[in-house]
């Protein structure tokens, strides 16, 4: 898939919603200039495309939601890359511009006659994209044309700024919340000295900045902070990992505010360099409970603690998705390519990928094999429903007593739609309330996951806790089989009684050497020894001074025993 020809998925309707999904992986470093995307993705790509198509079917068949109005869509591939997503967003805008000019009778043929050509309907709003960096670029464009955007996984804190991103909303919380959750986990296990890694780009940078700020306030020191692109080469990951080893054995915990593919890059480097088991990775929701991150590198990932946005599986999606077959699913233009990639086989009569696979796809193949639902499926569906409810409320207010699109909604005014969307609240697909605060953000609820070896060569994520609006709950016995197994990640051990901490010049406050106080000194505070005043002596616990009792000599007392310097 290169920049010359982009495939689009269409579904007709009275109102068209745009969507950007990462149907393919981002371009590798050497292919960035061509905007040539990587391999097709199932969870982040195909499943989300199918979720959009099927959710719209459900909305359209719901008599209580947008009655007499059919929602359609135009789905484009963002490839998890800003340049590709921008190019695709321009296509959305171009359609909208042509449509609005046509509404105003501005479309004319070169000879001056009016055009009978009907262009595509304008996009009223956009769902996605997944990545924060990409979402920011897309928002910068969409807001110029008053097109609301609802994200399902772009969690960067920057996007809360409505002065910059007025038309942006999301059904997920801002990363400020999960940064807090990560700090709370670090605090819980008394890890005071940790290394930090983040994915280059907005998600990782702003998230790590928040993590560092909050850590500093809690007395947690960062041994060193590193950044890397998800599509960086092996050498870059090897280099980063070697740098992390230079902080061992003290900084064993690595806090990673990272996209999933950054974590995978780290795991692969651990395998190459022989560093499995040296670190405990604490990962943000870019990792969550994704198997595409750990597949083939489970040994390296064992012990990892991750943050996952609370979102149970959507059963009705699986009921629909698992029945899909390449010979009947023609509305998803990427489905045949995906099928071949998923099963490593060749579909008869499908030219695109033929050279890659030798064997022909068996007719008994089914998506039920090794099926894992996208962990953010609930959010994708909630984002689509948010758009539908926003349009529904707008229709009720602009077209009272009218079923369908009245003139007041032709064309749809993006400003009014945004207003309506911000006021939207409804019960989400998992039974939770979906609502937006003044920044267009949703409340924060997270699950804490732990990647464990469950049996011989069998690994899985297990839920070991939750973080809900500032409260961390953890099942410590599930994470650590016994107290002594809790990993230590500290720079210096506490000083013994009668010792003070001496922080070396240029060192962080968590690294010190312990120095004993002098014989006549007591520990004034953890960094200072103070001499006792004349006539007093340090107490046994060296926390203060006691007066030395004065003993008077009386006649008849034996002479004090003393030795002269000359006595040998």
């Amino acid at each position: 898939q290169s920049s010359e020809r982009r495939v689009v998925a269409h579904m007709p309707g009275d109102i068209i919603i745009g969507a950007l999904f990462s149907v393919h992986h981002q371009p590798t470093v050497d292919k960035v200039h061509e905007r040539k995307c990587g391999a097709v993705r199932e969870q982040y790509g195909i499943q989300r495309v199918e979720a959009m198509l099927h959710t719209l079917e459900r909305i359209n068949s719901d008599p209580t939601l947008l009655p007499n109005i059919t929602l359609g869509c135009e789905i484009r591939d963002s490839c998890w890359h800003s340049a590709v997503a921008l190019e695709q967003s321009i296509e959305f805008i171009r359609d909208s511009l042509i449509s609005s000019e046509e509404e105003e009778g501005l479309v004319r043929c070169v000879d001056g006659s009016s055009s009978s050509f009907r262009s595509k309907k304008p996009i009223v709003g956009v769902i996605g994209p997944g990545s924060s960096s990409v979402a920011i670029q897309v928002q910068n464009l969409l807001q110029l044309f008053n097109i609301p955007q609802i994200a399902y996984s772009a969690t960067s804190m920057d996007l809360s700024d409505k002065t910059l991103f007025k038309y942006f909303m999301r059904v997920v919380p801002s990363d400020a919340q999960q940064a807090r959750a990560m700090v709370d986990i670090v605090k819980r296990y008394n890890w005071t000295y940790v290394s930090a890694v983040h994915t280059e780009g907005n998600y990782g940078e702003s998230g790590m900045e928040a993590f560092k700020d909050m850590s500093a306030k809690e007395g947690i020191c960062i041994a060193h902070s590193y950044k890397i692109y998800s599509n960086a080469g092996e050498q870059s990951f090897d280099k980063l990992l070697k740098k992390l080893t230079s902080h061992l054995p003290k900084a064993r915990v690595v806090a990673c505010f990272c996209e999933g593919m950054t974590v995978r890059g780290l795991l692969m480097a651990m395998r190459r360099l022989g560093l499995a088991g040296e670190f405990l990775l604490l990962g943000s929701d870019g990792w969550a409970d994704r198997y595409d991150v750990t597949d083939g590198y489970q040994r390296e990932a064992v012990g990892g603690i991750t943050i996952k946005l609370q979102s149970p599986d959507v059963k009705w999606f699986d009921d629909y998705y698992l029945k899909l077959r390449p010979e009947t699913n023609h509305r998803n233009p990427w489905f045949q390519e995906f099928w071949q990639h998923r099963f490593q086989c060749r579909l008869e009569g499908f030219p695109q990928e033929n050279s890659k696979y030798n064997k022909t796809c068996d007719s008994s193949l089914t998506l039920k094999t090794h099926h894992v639902q996208d962990s953010k499926m609930g959010f994708v569906i909630n984002a689509i429903y948010s758009m539908a409810y926003g349009l529904h409320n707008m229709q009720m207010s602009l077209c009272p007593g009218y079923a369908g699109l009245c003139d007041a909604m032709k064309p749809i005014d993006g400003r009014k739609l945004l207003e309506s969307l911000m006021k939207t609240n409804f019960t989400g697909v998992s039974g939770d309330m979906i609502l937006f605060d003044e920044n267009g953000d949703s409340p924060g609820r997270y699950e804490i996951m732990n990647f464990k070896e469950m049996g011989k060569d069998y690994f899985d994520y297990i839920n070991v806790g939750s973080w809900d609006n500032g409260e961390l709950k953890m099942d410590d016995d599930e994470v650590w089989s016994k107290k002594s197994n809790i990993i230590r990640s500290v720079c210096s051990e506490p000083c013994e009684k009668g010792q003070i901490k001496v922080i070396r010049k240029g060192e962080v406050s968590c690294c010190w050497t312990c120095t004993p106080c002098k014989e006549n000194e007591y520990v004034f505070d953890e960094y200072t020894c103070k001499a006792c005043q004349l006539g007093s002596w340090p107490t046994d616990d060296l926390t203060g001074c006691d007066l030395i009792p004065v003993q008077y000599l009386r006649w008849g007392d034996p002479e004090p025993d003393y030795k002269d310097d000359d006595d040998k």
Epitope: Q235, D238, T245, S246, P249, R271, R272, L273, G274, E278
Partner: antibody, heavy 116, light 110 residues
Framework: QSLEESGGRLVTPGTPLTLTCTVS????????VGWVRQAPGKGLEYIGI?????NTWYASWVKGRFTISKTSTTVDLKMTSLTTEDTATYFC?????????????WGPGTLVTVSS | AYDMTQTPASVEVAVGGTVTIKCQAS??????LAWYQQKPGQPPKLLIY???DLASGVPSRFKGSGSGTEYTLTISGVQCDDAATYYC????????????FGGGTEVVVK
């Protein structure tokens, strides 16, 4: 700070043997220790390493014949299925850091002779 | 695997001369390379690490350079005491490796 190998001797093929590297002034919970051998007149050959964490890694040719373990002051190299090819001087060396890197402090070596 | 190939196997140099030893890795080791000097009956001694950093107490006539897969040890103003065998070692990876050391270069000083 020093390392010293011991346990090297003449053995017959197939006899198991354990070499011990005794360290002085080195905190084994902070440094990695590696084992390297050198056959008479030949070059250095890497055997394996034990990290500060206790994790071990071996050269691919070792294939389970050798095992490295440690206490707070010693690092052992347990050798099984010895053949005449294993005749060499065995060195233990302290790593530059907690994991694999460079060896900046070496023991004098201990000679192992495998002969029938 | 990160295999190390060292050339030449042996080199003769006059006192005061310059000797160059090369080491090639089968894949990039990103400057994680060390050079050792070994004299008969003694253990190896670390000379250079991270491709170009001099270990403490090592004379400045020893110089390391290179990056990626190609590395060089240069000894200028060679002295009699420099007669020894020199080994390179990749310090990057210990998983799936056969030998982390190069084959060695014997330096004979005339």
């Amino acid at each position: 700070q020093s390392l010293e190998e011991s346990g090297g001797r003449l053995v017959t093929p197939g006899t198991p043997l354990t070499l011990t590297c005794t360290v002085s002034g080195i905190d084994l919970s902070s440094y990695a220790v590696g084992w390297v051998r050198q056959a008479p007149g030949k070059g250095l050959e890497y055997i394996g390493i034990i990290y500060a964490s206790g994790n071990t890694w071996y050269a691919s040719w070792v294939k389970g014949r050798f095992t490295i373990s440690k206490t707070s002051t010693t690092v052992d190299l347990k050798m099984t299925s010895l053949t005449t090819e294993d005749t060499a001087t065995y060195f233990c060396a302290r790593g530059h850091g907690a994991t694999y890197d460079y060896f900046n402090l070496w023991g004098p070596g201990t000679l192992v002779t495998v002969s029938s | 695997a990160y295999d190390m190939t060292q050339t030449p196997a042996s080199v003769e140099v006059a006192v005061g001369g310059t000797v160059t030893i090369k080491c090639q890795a089968s894949q990039s080791i990103s400057s994680w390379l060390a050079w050792y000097q070994q004299k008969p009956g003694q253990p190896p001694k670390l000379l250079i690490y991270d491709a170009s950093d001099l270990a403490s107490g090592v004379p400045s006539r020893f110089k390391g350079s290179g990056s990626g897969t190609e590395y060089t040890l240069t000894i200028s103003g060679v002295q009699c005491d420099d007669a020894a065998t020199y080994y390179c070692q990749q310090g990057l990876a210990t998983a799936n490796v056969d030998n982390v050391f190069g084959g060695g270069t014997e330096v004979v000083v005339k």
